[in-house]
């Protein structure tokens, strides 16, 4: 598509947008990885901002003995199910009250025997690089606490003195799922064909996906007076020419005084 706009060299700009850029009638709209008038430059930093929180879900089964099973409990919209859910949730909130990562419980199924409760325990923690350890520890505490309560709160002479009583042998942990967050993998994927040159560095426990062209990090490439530019073969320094000097070298650190060249002398500094 050809679009006419105003300004020098503006004819056919639409067809000149590079790297998948699209012309919006005024300028090239660049995909995430690119910027510049024609989307010709590769960004030096990609936002892989981690989720604010990471979640885990534990699939548990406990057997409640202080409630007798009735068919209505199978129906999640019944008054029986709603009352059971209320008591069970209150009981579990007490059981797990000392776990900062605990969010709540979600009953998935109630079945006969006395009342077998299939449910999820939901955990959440603020993202830090150590989130996996935090959630692993929390799941261990959940196991300890549910084992303890289902051992202690039991029926005596067919009577329960607690909010709920349990069958000690009916407690099982079926599965534990932790939301996976891998900043290195995300960084590589989002950098696409430049993935080999982008790395993750942490600042204030937040991951940054950067190329060596991004200043201020330990991997940053110092191009001195030059400009760092990313290409498929890696980051390169584009050296500048000033009124008095040419700059060259891997990091544009070699300055040649123009007047000396014209006088057939080289002077490096």
């Amino acid at each position: 598509r050809t679009t006419t706009c105003f300004g020098d060299g503006c004819q056919n700009t639409a067809s000149r947008c590079k790297n998948g850029g699209t012309w919006d009638g005024l300028k090239c709209q660049c995909p995430n990885l690119y910027y510049g008038e024609l989307c010709e430059e590769v960004v030096s930093s990609i936002d892989i901002g981690p989720p604010e929180t990471i979640s885990a879900q534990m699939e548990l089964t406990v057997t409640v003995t202080s409630v007798k099973f009735t068919e209505e409990l199978k129906n999640h919209s019944s008054q029986e199910f709603q009352e059971f859910k209320q008591t069970f949730t209150e009981q579990m909130n007490i059981v797990y009250s000392g776990i900062p990562e605990y969010v709540g419980v979600n009953i998935t199924k109630l079945r006969l025997g006395s009342v077998v409760v299939e449910h999820d325990v939901l955990l959440r923690t603020k993202y830090t690089p150590e989130y996996k350890t935090v959630l692993d520890n929390a799941t261990e505490v959940v196991k300890e606490k549910i084992t303890k309560v289902t051992t202690q709160q039991i029926m005596i002479n067919d009577i329960c003195s607690d909010m709920m009583c349990f069958n000690t042998t009916g407690t099982q942990v079926q599965n534990i799922t932790v939301t996976q967050y891998d900043p290195e993998e995300d960084c590589r994927k989002m950098a696409k064909e430049y993935g080999d040159y982008f790395v993750v560095e942490y600042r204030d426990q937040k991951p940054y996906c950067i190329s060596p062209c991004e200043p201020g990090f330990s991997v940053s490439k110092n191009c001195n007076l030059g400009k760092c530019q990313m290409s498929l073969s890696g980051p390169q320094c584009l050296c500048v020419t000033t009124e008095t000097h040419w700059y060259s070298g891997e990091t544009c650190n070699q300055g040649t005084q123009k007047s000396l060249v014209y006088g057939h002398h080289h002077h490096h500094h």
């Epitope: 409630v67 007798k68 209505e72 008054q79 009352e83 008591t87 209150e90 009577i159 003195s161 909010m163």
Partner: nanobody
Framework: EVQLQASGGGVVQPGGSLRLSCAAS????????WGWFRQAPGKEREAVAL???????FYADSVKGRFTISQDNSKNTLYLQMNSLRAEDTAVYYC?????????????????WGQGTMVTVSS
């Protein structure tokens, strides 16, 4: 939603009798569990007598042989017949209900409560 209205309290001499009633509105009276709890000044609420739709009943040791729990499904009413009353029976009496078939004495497991009716046993 179950609504409960307790009545029948009063002042009675030791050895006397009272019958408490608890009228229920709603269509759930024939299922679940029903009970009488009491709370004496400065003490926790405790289960006195409980009954479930499967025929199970419970009486606190302190009232066994003296109190009787019953229900009239046609009138949607729960009763507590209290005989041989003692000074230590003085308390506010509450009726409670749940659509669940419960086997627990803990008040926290009971979802619906009537307002209390005062029973004073004094000479």
């Amino acid at each position: 939603e179950v609504q409960l209205q307790a009545s029948g309290g009063g002042v009675v001499q030791p050895g006397g009798s009272l019958r408490l009633s608890c009228a229920a509105s709603g269509d759930t009276f024939s299922r679940g569990s029903w009970g009488w709890f009491r709370q004496a000044p400065g003490k926790e609420r405790e289960a006195v007598a409980l009954i479930s739709s499967d025929g199970w009943t419970f009486y606190a040791d302190s009232v066994k042989g003296r109190f009787t729990i019953s229900q009239d499904n046609s009138k949607n009413t729960l009763y507590l017949q209290m005989n041989s009353l003692r000074a230590e029976d003085t308390a506010v009496y509450y009726c409670a209900a749940s659509v669940l078939v419960l086997r627990t004495l803990n008040p926290k497991a009971w979802h619906h409560w009537g307002q209390g009716t005062m029973v004073t046993v004094s000479s």
